[in-house]
């Protein structure tokens, strides 16, 4: 029987991405996401 | 693009203050926002400090918050950052940048200009 493992050997690397809320409306104050595999989840 | 040119750069004691200036050419200066980042020997450049076209909102790394202060003079096309309790740690080539409406603010790879830098060596 195949052994299987959680572990592929991928790391999935995040990065936090400020925003200004400004650049898409008329709020002040910054917007944070977070970016996971290249795809922004928050 | 706007072209940026950074001074204000020295020597100075550990706790001491420095205020750095960027000199934006260009009539598009208030289509920007812009940042400060530093970049120290055998370093990434890293984020230090944003802030928005409109001067009204700021945002800061961990490293520098309550120390530094960025503010922008959209009359003079300037940019500056005043620089307060400085560490050893904080010694590098501060750069300062442009970055597009709806870029990421913090991540150098969203600003198109940038300036040739300016030196900040925090030393006793």
């Known amino acids: 029987d195949a052994e299987f493992r959680h572990d592929s050997g991928y790391e999935v690397h995040h990065q936090k991405l400020v925003f200004f809320a400004e650049d898409v409306g008329s709020n002040k104050g910054a917007i944070i996401g977070l970016m996971v595999g290249g795809v922004v989840i928050a | 693009e706007v072209q940026l040119v950074e001074s204000g750069g020295g020597l100075v004691q550990p706790g001491g203050s420095l205020r750095l200036s960027c000199a934006a050419s260009?009539?598009?200066?208030?289509?920007?926002?812009m940042g400060w980042f530093r970049q120290s020997p055998g370093k990434e450049r890293e984020f230090v400090a944003t802030?928005?076209?409109?001067?009204?909102?700021?945002y800061y790394a961990d490293s520098v918050k309550g120390r530094f202060t960025i503010s922008r003079d959209s009359a003079k096309n300037a940019v500056y950052m005043q620089m307060n309790s400085l560490k050893p740690e904080d010694t590098a080539v501060y750069y300062c940048?442009?970055?597009?409406?709806?870029?990421?603010?913090?991540?150098?790879?969203?600003?198109?200009?940038w300036g040739q830098g300016t030196q900040v060596t925090v030393s006793s």
């Open positions: 940048a442009a970055a597009r409406i709806g870029a990421a603010v913090n991540i150098p790879s969203e600003y198109g200009s």
């Open positions: 260009g009539r598009t200066f208030t289509s920007y926002n």
């Open positions: 802030i928005s076209r409109s001067g009204g909102s700021t």
